[in-house]
């Protein structure tokens, strides 16, 4: 004999000893019908704010308040936004690796320093993790260039830099 709880819709709960579909109480939800209980809705407070409010069929979704970003599945925690010279990774904010920079506050990824030699120019000011290199005026006489291979932290990928 089929249990009538099997016919219950999401947003309801049903107990086998009294197989009647009942609506989820306030601040609870059930995304699958026929369950014996509804789940308690997530509350977004403190560093969290509501991205999506709870309904009888779906849990609430949280996001982080201004100046913070989510970490972990379903935004389980909030971390302060990255500073210039850093980029966001799963592990949180990491300093830009050698040969890259990020001049943005809170967003963006580390990007490579400009290769001045592509435009036939010399490096006037070397780059930092927060600032790109500053290229000088075009070089008139080209001396042989030396290629320095800079390996990004932790990996075999080389960043090709030209020193003139």
């Amino acid at each position: 004999v089929q249990n009538s709880c099997d016919n219950c819709q999401p947003g309801t709960f049903c107990r086998k000893y009294n197989p009647v579909c009942k609506s989820c109480p306030p601040s609870t939800f059930s995304s699958i019908g026929g369950q014996p209980n509804c789940n308690i809705c997530r509350v977004c407070a403190g560093y969290f704010r509501f991205k999506k409010f709870c309904s009888s069929t779906h849990n609430a979704e949280c996001e982080c308040i201004e100046g913070f970003h989510c970490l972990g599945p379903q935004c389980t925690r909030c971390e302060k936004d990255c500073r210039p010279g850093q980029e966001l990774t799963k592990q949180g904010c990491k300093t830009c690796s050698l040969g890259t920079f990020n001049d943005q506050n809170g967003t963006g990824v580390c990007r490579p320093w400009t290769n001045c030699s592509l435009d036939g120019r010399s490096v006037l000011k070397t780059g930092t993790t927060e600032k790109d290199v500053v290229c000088g005026p075009p070089v008139v006489s080209f001396s042989p260039s030396t290629t320095i291979s800079v390996t990004p932290e932790g990996g075999p990928g080389g960043h090709s830099l030209q020193v003139l």
Partner: antibody, heavy 121, light 111 residues
Framework: EVQLVESGGGLVQPGGSLRLSCAAS????????IYWVRQAPGKGLEWIGN????????FYGEKFMGRATFSADTSKNTAYLQMNSLRAEDTAVYYC??????????????WGQGTLVTVSS | SVELTQPPSVSVSPGQTARITCKLN????????VHWYQQKPGQAPVTMIY?????PDGIPERFSGSSDSSSNSAFLTISGVQAEDEADYYC??????????FGGGTKLTVL
């Protein structure tokens, strides 16, 4: 709609070179990394390197240093891969892909259709 | 350096659940985002799961991503497998934020 369209593949003699194009549209070309990835017949995906079109900055996989060169023409929203001294083992489908600006360890959200390069005499 | 290991093949009957493993050789799986791509013959890869467990628009709910710290592995789970799911699946992470690393790929066969 974001699109990456590749061209330039074909038959190349051993020792020869290739120049592949990756034409981007539907987004700000200078604000996203373009990665180059290849796939030999029946094999997995292999990273060649990547370029930041905004300033021409490049990174190369160790295996491809000195043999591959990336460039970008921002007026044409196109990235290029030049590869020299080609060998039979360079026969592969070459893909360009875009990485979002969310995090440093993010996925590739758009891929080109791929272009087949065959190195053979 | 970081390496990702996948089984070469997984077979499953239609309607069953397929689970593809991506094992990290060093470090902690919880420290790395893992992304999953599906590739059918003659086509470019398509993102199925990104940032561990997120599904792009248009990808069926049958596809889900997870990880397990005890086995240091990430998983792509396909519930209610359909014939059209037959393809190669690749996991993807990073050795550094510059250097992407791919698993060797898993061929999913729907019996």
């Amino acid at each position: 709609e974001v699109q990456l369209v590749e061209s330039g593949g074909g038959l190349v003699q051993p020792g020869g070179s290739l120049r592949l194009s990756c034409a981007a549209s539907g987004y700000t070309f200078t604000s996203y990394y373009i990665y180059w990835v290849r796939q030999a017949p029946g094999k997995g995906l292999e990273w060649i390197g990547n370029i930041w079109p905004g300033n021409g900055g490049t990174f190369y996989g160790e295996k491809f240093m000195g043999r591959a060169t990336f460039s970008a023409d921002t007026s044409k929203n196109t990235a290029y891969l030049q590869m020299n001294s080609l060998r039979a083992e360079d026969t592969a489908v070459y893909y360009c892909a875009r990485r979002p600006d969310y995090s440093g360890d993010d996925y590739f959200d758009y891929w080109g259709q791929g272009t087949l390069v065959t190195v053979s005499s | 350096s970081v390496e990702l290991t996948q089984p070469p093949s997984v077979s499953v009957s239609p309607g069953q659940t397929a689970r593809i493993t991506c094992k990290l050789n060093s470090g902690n799986i919880g420290s790395y985002y893992v992304h999953w791509y599906q590739q059918k013959p003659g086509q470019a890869p398509v993102t199925m799961i990104y940032r561990d467990d997120k599904r792009p628009d248009g990808i069926p709910e049958r596809f889900s991503g997870s990880s397990d710290s005890s086995s240091n592995s990430a998983f792509l789970t396909i519930s209610g497998v359909q014939a059209e799911d037959e393809a190669d699946y690749y996991c993807h992470s990073y050795d550094s934020t510059i250097t992407p690393v791919f698993g060797g790929g898993t061929k999913l066969t729907v019996l």
